[in-house]
């Protein structure tokens, strides 16, 4: 019973975690414009792994995809790769763990096979979670480095002609979603690995003992039958998260109700 609960909980936690990793990967707010020196701005910039966006005071939001592949920073490419690897591993892990669930009957699959599949999915979840945490951490480190390199009054020349105030970026919501999701996936993976130990068939020290009754010869083998918990009948696969689709107006940049500028 405890094993089934641990396995089921591990699966659910991992499912939520992977949904979160997918959401974080799709989110546009990996980095947001630092508003420390200018808390009220008419143009607000934020960036994701796939596109950068600008939200104007008017409410108009414009997003532009990073259509170049070679022109992007290597670190950004690495973060993308880590997140995608995390999603792929997590998705495969989820698929494997569905069949590994003790409450789901698939033919005459033995407990040893389920134990192996649980361990495999657990390891996949752990690696998936680590990939997400690593990806988000690499991006966060990149932001911190860039933040201190660019100061509020630092100007960068555009072709020696135009001077633009450098926009500083700070941590966006996606980073926190990614960290939490990666952590959940990792925890779910550990739970699956713990559940695997309980699923593995135990070696029995009992020898088979024959009892001879008159007229019939019946052999009783203690430990030969395992009781199974019947959770299978009402188990449903619920959709935990819906694809990471977001509206542009979901996050409001207004710092306060009344601002004087």
């Amino acid at each position: 019973m405890a094993v089934t609960a641990c396995q089921g909980l591990g699966f659910v936690v991992s499912l939520i975690g992977i949904a979160g990793i997918i959401a974080a990967t799709c989110m546009d707010q990996w980095s947001t414009q630092d508003l420390y020196n200018n808390p009220v701005t008419a143009v607000f910039n934020y960036q994701g792994l796939w596109r950068s966006c600008v939200r104007e005071s008017s409410g108009f939001t414009e997003c532009r995809g990073y259509f170049t592949l070679l022109g992007l920073p290597a670190m950004l490419q690495a973060v993308r790769a880590l997140m995608i690897v995390g999603i792929v591993l997590g998705a495969i892990g989820l698929l494997v763990s569905i069949f590994a669930l003790k409450c789901i009957r698939i033919g005459s699959m033995e407990d040893s096979a389920k134990a192996n599949m649980t361990l495999t999915s657990g390891i996949m979840f752990i690696v998936s979670g680590l990939c997400a945490i690593a990806g988000v951490s690499v991006f966060a480190n990149m932001l911190v480095t860039n933040f201190w390199m660019s100061t509020a009054n630092m100007y960068t020349g555009m072709g020696g002609m135009v001077q633009t105030v450098q926009t500083r970026y700070t941590f966006g919501a996606a980073l926190f979603v990614g960290w939490v999701a990666g952590g959940l996936t990792l925890i779910g993976g550990v739970m699956m690995c713990i559940a695997c130990r309980g699923l593995a068939p135990e070696e029995t020290n009992y020898k088979a003992v024959s009892y001879h009754a008159s007229g019939h010869s019946v052999a009783y083998k203690p430990g030969g039958f395992k009781a199974s918990t019947g959770f299978g009948s009402n188990t449903k696969n619920k959709k935990i998260y819906d694809g990471g689709a977001r509206t542009e107006d979901e996050v409001q940049s207004y710092p306060s109700k009344h601002d004087y500028v």
Partner: antibody
């Protein structure tokens, strides 16, 4: 057809308050930000502030801090600009305008003339 | 606050002439996020409210004749009227739409020569 219609001309005494209304039609009122701009006779344009009707968020020019209050009544699609402690230099035409793409004001009303005189 | 300075303060022109007026901002209006310049041009005729001509420094508002064009980046901007018509005689204002408070230039008056 987007339209902004302001209240009529006002004559006020120094120290009094004036409340100018701006009724919007032809679009969803909460979709666009409303800006207020004034223009003294023969002078240039001066930005007063803006209100986001959806959340009621307001941003004011430092010059009018504490004297101006922008409000919006979404039920009747009307924005209001109240200016208190009036002085003679507040005599001007007050415009409301819709802020659109590029933070540009692309729909203006005909303006309300406010005269401050003792 | 961003200070907007327009030059010249007035221009005397004849119909069909090409006209350019300048606008300078005390800070860059170029947003690095989308590489757009947040500068807006308005036209105001006597007794009328201002009319939007150009936003993002060079994007013409729909319905504005193509003889009007905007250019420039960062801190220096220009409004050009390729062939002035009688109905173009008005005051032209540039505006910072990048940072609060939104600030306007003092205007350039276009008059008949």
């Amino acid at each position: 057809q987007v339209q902004l219609v302001q209240s009529g001309a006002e004559v006020k005494k120094p120290g009094a308050s004036v409340k100018v209304s701006c009724k919007a039609s032809g679009y969803t009122f909460t979709s666009y930000v409303i800006n207020w701009v004034r223009q003294a006779t023969g002078q240039g344009l001066e930005w007063i502030g803006e209100i986001h009707p959806r959340g009621g968020n307001t941003y004011y020019s430092e010059k009018f801090r504490g004297r101006v209050t922008l409000t919006a009544d979404t039920s009747i699609s009307t924005a209001y600009m109240e200016l208190s402690s009036l002085r003679s230099e507040d005599t001007a035409v007050y415009y409301c305008a819709i802020l659109r793409r590029g933070n540009a004001m692309d729909y203006w009303d005909q303006g309300t003339t406010v005269t401050v005189s003792s | 606050d961003i200070v907007m300075t327009q030059s010249p303060s007035s221009l005397a022109v004849s119909a069909g002439e090409m006209v350019t007026m300048n606008c300078k901002s005390s800070q860059s209006l170029l947003n690095s996020g989308n590489q757009r310049n947040y500068l807006t041009w308005y036209q105001q005729k006597p007794g009328q409210p201002p009319k939007l001509l150009i936003y993002w420094a060079s994007t013409r508002e729909s319905g504005v004749p193509d003889r009007f064009s905007g250019s420039g980046s960062g801190t220096d901007f220009t409004l050009t009227i390729s062939s002035v018509q009688a109905e173009d005689l008005a005051v032209y204002y540039c505006q910072n739409s990048y940072n609060y408070p939104y600030t306007f230039g003092q205007g350039t008056k276009l008059e008949r020569k």
